[in-house]
């Protein structure tokens, strides 16, 4: 099957504060069609939060999630 029919997700601004790590369930990079780089965190309550991929806390959460996958 080819890539899923999922809507394009872009970040136009980033969260200004660090989300508690235990709130996060998953993550993905924003679409290659977006003008701004971004990581989208999915919370356990199914909210999507935009984060700046250059922030160290964002990278830590991503690598921790990757290790636990």
């Amino acid at each position: 099957s080819l890539a899923a029919d999922t809507p394009t997700a872009c970040c136009f601004s980033y969260t200004s504060r660090q989300i508690p790590q235990n709130f996060i369930a998953d993550y993905f990079e924003t679409s290659s069609q977006c003008s701004k780089p971004g990581v989208i965190f999915l919370t356990k309550r199914s909210r999507q939060v935009c984060a700046d991929p250059s922030e160290e806390w964002v990278q830590k959460y991503v690598s921790d999630l990757e290790l636990s996958a």
Epitope: L2, A3, A4, D26, E29, S31, S32, S35, S54, E66
Partner: antibody, heavy 115, light 107 residues
């Protein structure tokens, strides 16, 4: 561990097309964009474009629009780049790389276009 | 497109030297500037991400600095295994672009 596997070489005739593969393993394929980069001795490293495996979204360098077509297959965790109407100018090493920071790269596919 | 200009094109070094490689952007790339090392017949390898962030497995002698349009990769005591090409790259805007590279060679 994270790996991007690419075939080592492709030999294709001028005017033909080629479809290169980049098989990802060791991470969730849909979490990161896959980028394609061309390297030639004269031109250095050139970004061709990127594909988002989650939904198939693509972004292309204007220079490669009409030349390259990027796709992704979630079921096999493989990204593809098709290059069409090949000429000797397309002979190069083509790399796939993962994510904004290009933290992992494939070994590269050497494309030779020759009759 | 953002043009990245690297200098010098070639740097001749002696093991133990401290060296600085420059990358200048034609417009601001914010913090989205990365450095790669490429040895002959190998794939590029990420050395520094987001201007100054270190990468697991990369020796601590490599460091990055700068902001906006002016960036530097420093190697504080060059070893022979560091010889090769060094590229900067920006991921702030499409198309992502690379510098032409700096070749690090033995004096």
């Amino acid at each position: 561990q994270v790996q991007l596997q690419q075939p080592g070489a492709e030999l294709v005739k001028p005017g033909a097309s080629v479809k290169m593969s980049c098989k990802a393993s060791g991470y969730t394929f849909t979490s990161y964009n896959i980028h394609w980069v061309k390297q030639t001795p004269g031109q250095g490293l050139e970004w061709i474009g990127a594909v988002s495996p989650r939904n198939g979204d693509t972004s292309y360098n204007q220079r490669f629009k009409g030349k390259a077509t990027l796709t992704a297959d979630i079921s096999s965790s493989t990204a593809y780049m098709q290059l069409s109407s090949l000429t000797s100018e397309d002979s190069a090493v083509y790399y796939c790389a993962r994510g904004y920071g290009y933290d992992y790269w494939g070994q590269g596919t050497t494309l030779t276009v020759s009759s | 497109d953002v043009v990245l200009t690297q200098s010098p094109a070639t740097l001749s070094v002696t093991p133990g030297d401290r060296v600085s490689l420059s990358c200048r952007a034609s417009q601001s790339v914010s913090k989205y500037l990365h450095w790669y090392q490429q040895k002959s017949h190998e794939s590029p390898r990420l050395l520094i991400k987001y201007v100054s962030q270190s990468i697991s497995g990369i020796p601590s002698r490599f460091s990055g600095s700068g902001s906006g349009t002016d960036f530097t990769l420093s190697i504080n005591s060059v070893e022979t295994e560091d010889l090769g090409m060094y590229f900067c790259q920006q991921s702030n805007s499409w198309p992502h672009t690379f510098g032409a590279g700096t070749k690090l060679e033995l004096k």
